[in-house]
């Protein structure tokens, strides 16, 4: 449906407020450095120009692209080669290659200062005398930190924002109702940009087919009931919707996101049993609430798998006809029985089923060379289910603090030469897996805790990426999408490594750890414990706890101190020369 | 839009031989598979033969197996059905065919076809 003006067509389906907030997302996501008032110049005078090609589609330069008339704004500023240096060169091109090395710039790690939380009474004062400006600058600060977060959901994310301080700065504890709000919006928002960012590292690693065959996979255990034509119809439109949200194409991303959650919604009855609620809510909670839909109860009597893809004569004919679309029947068939299943299990059995077709087909006798494919399946199953198994039980008797320090000797040692930061950052959130799924029961450990680690290890990936050190993370993070965490699991100690220098200073600590919370704690000493282990990979578990032990004392006992610097400066040097005799440094 | 043009069907005697082509667009041919079905007359559509889009897997129907040959060029965009030893049953007009998005596989009435070319097989 061609458009005269496309500018105007997504201003008139998406409402200026929408627009407006969906174009300052664009923007802050394409020029991180730039300060917030900037932003807002831009943002007014695109919606200016939206507004004459609404009043006049025929208007000039109405009909030009939208990624023309934002690229052309985004290269008015003035310091553009100052602040982001050959991001300028973007410039001196023509779309859609403009777009694409816009595209490329887009900083997962971006330099910027943490977001101190300030008092809740001047939060709610900010709020009061502007909340336009207030609300604006929350889908700033987290659209620049997070450049691939999902647009539509972080409206979504600025509607609850919005809800806890009209409801909080009214109340009589304002702090006791509005920080646990934050806290939450805060620890989700983050989940839902790891989300985000591994579905476009899907797309734009590994291509279009193998997102497909990931929401193949979800949205047939989500909706078992539903027909394959159905989810693929479904899987089509989701793909879609990504691919503009991952490619900067915002507003086309939202108004899509819209129409396939009223196309759900309309066709409700054959598509899935749970989404009544949902389907009741207003658009951005009802998008919400599709994406989050709990899984559908399987059809009663569904027939064995074998009878279509092992037993039939037509195997070979049907897979040669249509690989992709026989491939998907087996994704989809094997998908609705197994809700027990992590997607990216599914995924390998899928891999697997392709391979051996492809060399069972072009043999002289190929239903003797295929009868048994799904017996391959048993150890490709069997090895996530172990290891979920051990890693809950040591969690379990860890604790979490514990159990992510035991992943941080483990990844350190794996890949000693990733900056600790993102050492750090990775095995908390790895660590995390525990109180997150080893609570579920059996069925949803394994779809809880593998899909999860998917989305943590591709952090990992993308940071690496940034700032390539280590080829073993490259190796794991490129060969296959779906073997990533089998890869990263399978890495033993890292022999070629030589030990870091040992440097005082790294291990030197101050009266201001005593101020920290407890959380922020936590990473000084996590972030001295892979210290640790990069100057003594050798380091046995027993060392490294003695080690981490007297650290521990040192901070609690130098924290008491009436004079806590001289404290941790005389102690600090005592601590050290006995960590390094312990660890024979 | 999808195109295919089969040509090269005529008159021939049992034990003969014929080679059809199938020329095709609008598609991208190097990624699809390709199938012969034919209609005999007063009969329903069968299958004949499969070729998968890189031709490493070909498969054929009972009937046909190890008189017919089925190939294809994916620089020319074409696929191929040599026909040796011909028989009178094997008189039908025969349909190059590919696989139709949203179709069943194997429900070769929603593939894509052309118009087809006849084959007839008589002393």
């Known amino acids: 449906d061609a458009h005269k003006s496309e500018v105007a067509h997504r201003f008139k389906d998406l409402g200026e407020e929408n627009f407006k907030a969906l174009v300052l997302i664009a923007f802050a996501q394409y020029l991180q450095q730039c300060p917030f008032e900037d932003h807002v110049k831009l943002v007014n005078e695109v919606t200016e120009f939206a507004k004459t090609c609404v009043a006049d589609e025929s208007a000039e330069n109405c009909d030009k692209s939208l990624h023309t008339l934002f690229g052309d704004k985004l290269c008015t500023v003035a310091t553009l080669r100052e602040t982001y240096g050959e991001m300028a060169d973007c410039c001196a091109k023509q779309e859609p290659e403009r777009n694409e090395c816009f595209l490329q710039h887009k900083d997962d790690n971006p330099n910027l200062p943490r977001l101190v939380r300030p008092e809740v009474d001047v939060m709610c004062t900010a709020f009061h005398d502007n909340e336009e400006t207030f609300l604006k600058k929350y889908l700033y600060e987290i659209a620049r930190r997070h450049p691939y977060f999902y647009a539509p959901e972080l409206l979504f994310f600025a509607k609850r924002y919005k809800a806890a301080f009209t409801e909080c700065c009214q109340a009589a504890d304002k702090a006791a109702c509005l920080l646990p709000k934050l806290d939450e919006l805060r620890d989700e928002g983050k989940a839902s940009s790891a989300k985000q960012r591994l579905k476009c590292a899907s797309l734009q690693k590994f291509g279009e087919r193998a997102f497909k065959a990931w929401a193949v996979a979800r949205l047939s255990q989500r909706f078992p009931k539903a027909e394959f034509a159905e989810v693929s119809k479904l899987v089509t439109d989701l793909t879609k919707v990504h691919t503009e949200c991952c490619h900067g194409d915002l507003l086309e991303c939202a108004d899509d996101r819209a129409d396939l959650a009223k196309y759900i919604c309309e066709n409700q009855d054959s598509i899935s049993s749970k989404l009544k609620e949902c389907c009741e809510k207003p658009l951005l909670e009802k998008s919400h609430c599709i994406a989050e839909v709990e899984n559908d109860e399987m059809p009663a009597d569904l027939p064995s798998l074998a009878a279509d893809f092992v037993e039939s004569k037509d195997v070979c004919k049907n897979y040669a006809e249509a690989k992709d679309v026989f491939l998907g029947m087996f994704l989809y068939e094997y998908a609705r029985r197994h809700p027990d299943y992590s997607v990216v299990l599914l995924l390998r059995l899928a891999k697997t089923y392709e391979t051996t077709l492809e060399k069972c087909c072009a043999a002289a006798d190929p239903h003797e060379c295929y009868a048994k494919v799904f017996d391959e399946f048993k150890p490709l199953v069997e090895e996530p289910q172990n290891l979920i198994k051990q890693n809950c039980e040591l969690f379990e008797q860890l604790g979490e603090y514990k159990f992510q320090n035991a992943l941080l000797v483990r990844y350190t040692k794996k890949v000693p030469q990733v900056s600790t930061p993102t050492l750090v950052e990775v095995s908390r959130n790895l660590g995390k897996v525990g109180s997150k799924c080893c609570k579920h029961p059996e069925a949803k450990r394994m779809p809880c805790a593998e899909d999860y680690l998917s989305v943590v290890l591709n952090q990992l990936c993308v940071l690496h990426e940034k700032t390539p050190v280590s080829d073993r993370v490259t190796k794991c993070c490129t060969e296959s999408l779906v073997n990533r965490r089998p890869c990263f699991s399978a890495l033993e100690v890292d022999e070629t490594y030589v030990p870091k220098e040992f440097n005082a200073e790294t291990f030197t600590f101050h009266a201001d750890i005593c101020t920290l919370s407890e959380k922020e704690r936590q990473i000084k000493k996590q972030t001295a414990l892979v210290e640790l282990v990069k100057h003594k990979p050798k380091a046995t578990k027993e060392q490294l706890k003695a080690v981490m032990d007297d650290f521990a004392a040192f901070v609690e006992k130098c924290c008491k101190a009436d004079d806590k610097e001289t404290c941790f400066a005389e102690e600090g040097k005592k601590l050290v020369a006995a960590s390094q005799a312990a660890l024979g440094l | 839009e999808v195109q295919l043009v089969e040509s090269g069907g005529g008159e021939v005697q049992p034990g003969g031989s014929l080679r059809l082509s199938c020329a095709a667009s609008?598609?991208?041919?190097?990624?699809?598979?390709m199938v012969w079905v034919r209609q005999a007359p007063g009969k329903g559509l069968e299958w004949v033969s499969t070729?998968?889009?890189?031709?490493?897997?070909?498969v054929y129907a009972e009937s046909v197996k190890g008189r017919f040959t089925i190939s294809r060029d994916n620089a020319k965009n074409t696929v191929y059905l040599q026909m040796n030893s011909l028989r009178a049953e094997d008189t039908a007009v025969y349909y190059c065919?590919?696989?139709?998005?949203?179709?069943?596989?194997?429900?070769?009435?929603?593939?894509?076809r052309g118009q087809g070319t006849l084959v007839t097989v008589k002393p």
């Open positions: 070729i998968s889009d890189d031709a490493r897997i070909t």
């Open positions: 065919a590919t696989y139709r998005a949203g179709s069943r596989i194997g429900s070769y009435e929603d593939y894509y």
């Open positions: 609008g598609f991208t041919f190097s990624t699809s598979g």
